[in-house]
């Protein structure tokens, strides 16, 4: 029978190294043997190149292009063909399409004043037009409540967040996971990086102390408190 | 060291053919896209062809569009310009020349890097 | 296509000077952030043209650096400092950003 795409390709970059095009045939098909995608930069002397894709799923192919660190004027020219039949043609602006890497090595550490350190890494080297352009977003969620999760949107420069430990619960084990966008390219969100996970070991300040210690508290609040009116 | 030698130009009638030649040494010679440059007598340099390094594509100035056939051989590192349908406008010293590396998939320029010596065509009755 | 006009079309410059060339694109030549498709080409008397500037201002390989490139889009100069009976000949500039690749008129330089 003959091949028809049901749902043409989709294409994003990475915006330094690669660009995947996705696309959907009307019927199972072994992509890697009976397609294949011819892709072109609209550039003076480019070369015609071929990326074998392979199956996402049953009718669902996929196909990743090496491609040159991208800049904002280069166009594509792609082509899907089965066979020698041409089943779709097209053109693609990565700059126009960006999904951002995903963040690396996420990690959480304990930090002064009770709060959570969470760090990752900028999937970007720092000559890369994106590696100043990303905002993350965190997504902390209680690995036994699903009600209790939160999401923090980190719009500074640096990859960190500072997480007070006293807005998780107490004994709970908790997980995050980050991802991230560039604003400037009307980026699409990248894929979540894989989570981490640690126990938030967190107690209310008054529960860390003994009588005494309240005791002692108490004196000196009063101390205080009496010394301000005594001016007075 | 990077060479180019350039021969096939001779005195042709005008309507005649001609083939060029540009025998290429000390590079990647399929790596490099490959240019012919003209320049008439006592005239500035006119651009007339190019090609890329797999031969895949080909780019024709509009005077010699339809006349002019750029081709290359790169199990022989030679360049050709197939010209026919000559015209006493054609009249140049014909130089190939270095272009851009096409083995990434953005070609990377380095000007015309190297140019032969440059071959003599005639078109005249 | 791409219209190159180069100024002046004659110079006269004595030994030890500096000689500026300018060359004016009726498009930008800007493909991306430092690279301007725009080269510069010596032709002395008798022989081949020979690669002065690419990219605007990058020297070819060999090329002294009394030979400079400078400008961005569609104005572009080239300089010579200390300038030597040697850099006599015809200069030409050239956009290689798309076909058809084309040229200046020419300059052409005296040494007096």
């Known amino acids: 029978g003959s091949v028809k795409v049901l749902h043409e390709p989709s294409c994003f970059s990475d915006y330094i190294s690669t660009s995947v095009c996705q696309w959907k045939m009307d019927h199972p098909t072994n992509c890697s043997a009976e397609l294949r995608l011819s892709y072109q930069l609209d550039f003076m002397g480019s070369e015609n190149h071929t990326c074998v894709p392979e199956n996402r799923e049953d009718s669902v192919c996929v196909c990743s292009m090496p491609i040159d660190d991208a800049v904002e004027a280069d166009v594509y020219q792609l082509d899907l063909w089965a066979g020698q039949q041409l089943l779709w043609s097209g053109s693609f602006q990565p700059s126009k399409h960006v999904k951002p890497r995903t963040p690396g090595n996420l990690t959480v550490h304990p930090n002064i004043s009770h709060t959570w350190l969470l760090m990752w890494t900028n999937p970007y080297p720092t000559e890369n037009h994106l590696h100043s352009e990303l905002t993350y977003m965190v997504n902390v969620s209680n690995d036994n409540d699903p009600e209790d999760f939160k999401v923090y949107n980190v719009t500074y420069m640096g990859p960190t967040l500072r997480l007070a430990a006293s807005t998780l619960k107490s004994g709970a084990s908790y997980s995050a996971r980050v991802r991230a966008w560039a604003q400037t390219y009307n980026s699409t969100w990248s894929d979540w990086s894989p989570s981490t996970t640690w126990l938030n070991y967190y107690e209310p300040w008054e529960q860390h102390l003994g009588l005494n210690d309240i005791f002692e508290a108490q004196k000196i609040e009063w101390h205080e408190h009496h010394h301000h009116h005594h001016h007075h | 060291e990077v060479q180019l030698v350039e021969s096939g130009g001779d005195l042709v009638k005008p309507g005649g053919s001609l083939r060029l030649s540009c025998v290429a040494s000390?590079?990647?010679?399929?790596?490099?896209?490959m240019t012919w440059v003209r320049q008439a007598p006592g005239k500035g340099l006119q651009w007339v062809s190019t090609i890329s390094g797999s031969g895949g594509k080909t780019y024709y100035a509009d005077a010699v569009k339809g006349r002019f056939t750029i081709s290359r051989d790169n199990a022989k590192n030679t360049l050709y310009l197939q010209m026919n349908s000559l015209r006493a406008e054609d009249t140049a010293v014909y130089y190939c020349a270095v272009d851009r590396l096409t083995k990434t998939i953005r070609p990377q320029y380095y000007g015309l890097s190297v140019w032969g010596q440059g071959t003599l065509v005639t078109v005249s009755s | 296509d791409i219209v190159m006009t180069q100024t002046p079309l004659s110079l006269s410059v004595s030994p030890g000077e500096t000689a500026s060339i300018s060359c004016r694109a009726s498009q930008s030549l800007l493909y991306s952030i430092g690279y301007n498709y725009l080269d510069w080409y010596l032709q002395k008397p008798g022989q081949s043209p020979q690669g002065l500037i690419y990219?605007?201002?990058k020297r070819a390989s060999g090329v002294p650096d009394r030979f400079s490139g400078s400008g961005s889009g569609t104005d572009f100069t080239l300089r010579i400092s200390r300038v030597e009976a040697n850099d006599t000949g015809v200069y030409y500039c050239?956009?290689?950003?798309?076909?058809?690749?084309?040229f200046g008129q020419g300059t052409k330089l005296e040494i007096k």
């Open positions: 000390g590079f990647t010679f399929r790596d490099y896209a």
């Open positions: 050239m956009q290689a950003l798309r076909d058809p690749y084309t």
């Open positions: 990219l605007g201002s």
